[in-house]
């Protein structure tokens, strides 16, 4: 009689993570008597996957009833496949022996490959805010995919970015892989409403890439511009001075008025107006009693924005010796303003 052969007809099997893999194996003869075992890998370090004689195999089932005397189908199914199950599986026939069964014949092996989807990309930006014209780095990470081939692209408001570096780890063979990419983005004053998108394409996604996003509103700080102006005289001895705080983001802002270097009033921006680009405007005014001053008055609008060092704009009010003689319009004179950092 012809010697028993162990036939594994499938050289390779490709299964998606979470699905069931069927590993086929048949024997050409009932002789010699002895059990079948399935192994992953070859040599002394192989892993026993299924043992016909004994054991508990929660994820492994046999395709046919191995207890039937004339059974020659030793195929198995492995459920809930994960990337860790990838490898070459061997169906091995043992000959009954004493005290041990002896390995008799092995199949050629079936390579199980597992396709696993990448996790949703997570995009993270810098820890601290940055101002326009600065370059900031964003990172994108996705994990758990297999096979290793993967494509990652970066976009800002739909426009593809080119300044990025990507690594797929590990470099060698692995059950699953991770991708890590860092992109550099130059901020502009208009970026409050901008988005950075990381897009990952993989064979398991069937042309529908995964995307992770980051809003630049979390990253950008647009410092305000200040303008101090003197309004027409409201009464004979009063001058209304306004400080226009324009185009700032985020909203966190505190304004202090100083008269000749002494704090007059401090307030926090509350009822701001929003610009189309997402930045804010705010106005504060100060009523100055000119008659209370004998000399010229230096008014300073000092703004602390988002915890940054204060910026200020000053305005000089000239206090006239005889305001009544000069008329109400000359009670105060705008002599220009100068911007300086008073810290």
């Amino acid at each position: 009689e012809e010697e028993l052969q162990v036939i594994q007809p499938d050289k390779s099997v490709l299964v998606a993570a979470g699905e069931t893999a069927t590993l086929r194996c048949t024997a050409t003869s009932l002789i010699p008597v002895g059990p079948i075992q399935w192994f992953r890998g070859a040599g002394p370090g192989r892993e026993l996957i299924y043992n016909q004689k004994e054991g508990h195999f929660p994820r492994v089932t046999t395709v046919s009833d191995l207890t039937k005397r004339n059974n020659m189908d030793f195929s198995i199914r492995i459920g809930n496949i994960t990337p860790a199950d990838a490898g070459t599986y061997y169906c091995v026939k043992f000959r009954k022996g004493s005290p041990d069964d002896v390995e008799f014949k092995s199949g050629a092996g079936t390579e199980l490959s597992v396709r696993a989807k990448p996790s949703a990309p997570v995009v993270s930006g810098p820890a601290a805010r940055a101002t326009p014209q600065h370059t900031v780095s964003f990172t994108c990470e996705s994990h758990g995919f297999s096979p290793r081939d993967i494509t990652l692209k970066w976009f800002k408001n739909g426009n593809e970015l080119s300044d990025f570096q990507t690594n797929v780890d590990p470099v060698g063979e692995s059950v699953s892989y991770s991708i890590h990419s860092t992109a550099k983005v130059v901020l502009t004053r208009e970026d409050v409403h901008s988005q950075v998108i990381c897009e990952v394409a993989h064979v398991t996604l069937q042309g529908d890439p995964l995307r992770g996003t980051a809003n630049l509103s979390e990253t950008i700080r647009v410092p305000p511009t200040l303008e101090v102006t003197q309004q027409p005289v409201r009464a004979e001895n009063q001058v209304n001075v306004t400080c226009q705080v324009r185009k700032f983001y985020p909203q966190r802002l505190q304004l202090t008025w100083l008269e000749n270097g002494n704090v007059s009033r401090t307030e926090t921006a509350s009822t701001v107006t929003e610009n189309k680009d997402g930045t804010y405007n705010w106005m504060s005014w100060l009523l100055v009693n000119v008659s209370a001053h004998r000399d010229d008055v230096k008014l300073t609008c000092q703004v602390e924005h988002d915890g940054q060092p204060a910026v200020s704009k000053s305005h000089d009010l000239k206090v006239s010796a005889h305001p009544k003689e000069q008329g109400s319009n000359t009670a105060a004179e705008n002599t220009g303003s100068n911007e300086r950092n008073i810290y």
Epitope: L48, Y50, G55, F57, P58, D85
Partner: nanobody
């Protein structure tokens, strides 16, 4: 070289549950088949349960089937033995073992490394 350290033993009442843990170091854990054994006073060391390196196949001594469950966490280099419905005759020192090759309940012969053991006492 593989170092194994058991923990989780103690004194319990009959019918109670206990979970033993064994942490392995010194070699890639996912390349090791793992097992638990026990030795009662005056008796030989006996096989309790074994698990293959990925956890796909498990083996139990007949007297422990249904009561004991072996599992592993390859990310944490840990193997566990969950023991339910404990009996006074389960009193023993429980040993963790690691094998480079694994042939089911032939594990005692194949174990290359052993822990120091943890005492489990079940009182009636």
């Amino acid at each position: 070289q593989v170092q194994l350290q058991e923990s989780g033993g103690g004194v319990v009442q009959a019918g109670d549950s206990l979970r033993l843990s064994c942490v392995a170091s010194g070699r890639t854990f996912s390349s090791l088949d793992m097992g638990w054994f026990r030795q009662a006073p005056g008796k030989e060391r006996e096989f309790v349960a074994g698990i293959s390196r990925s956890g796909i196949s498990q083996y139990y001594a007949n007297s422990m089937k249904g009561r004991f469950t072996i599992s592993r966490d390859n990310a944490k280099n840990l193997v566990y033995l969950q023991m339910n419905s404990l009996k006074p005759e389960d009193t023993a020192v429980y040993y963790c073992a690691a094998a480079l090759t694994f042939r089911g309940s032939d594990l005692p012969r194949d174990s290359n490394y052993w822990g120091q053991g943890t005492q489990v006492t079940v009182s009636s």
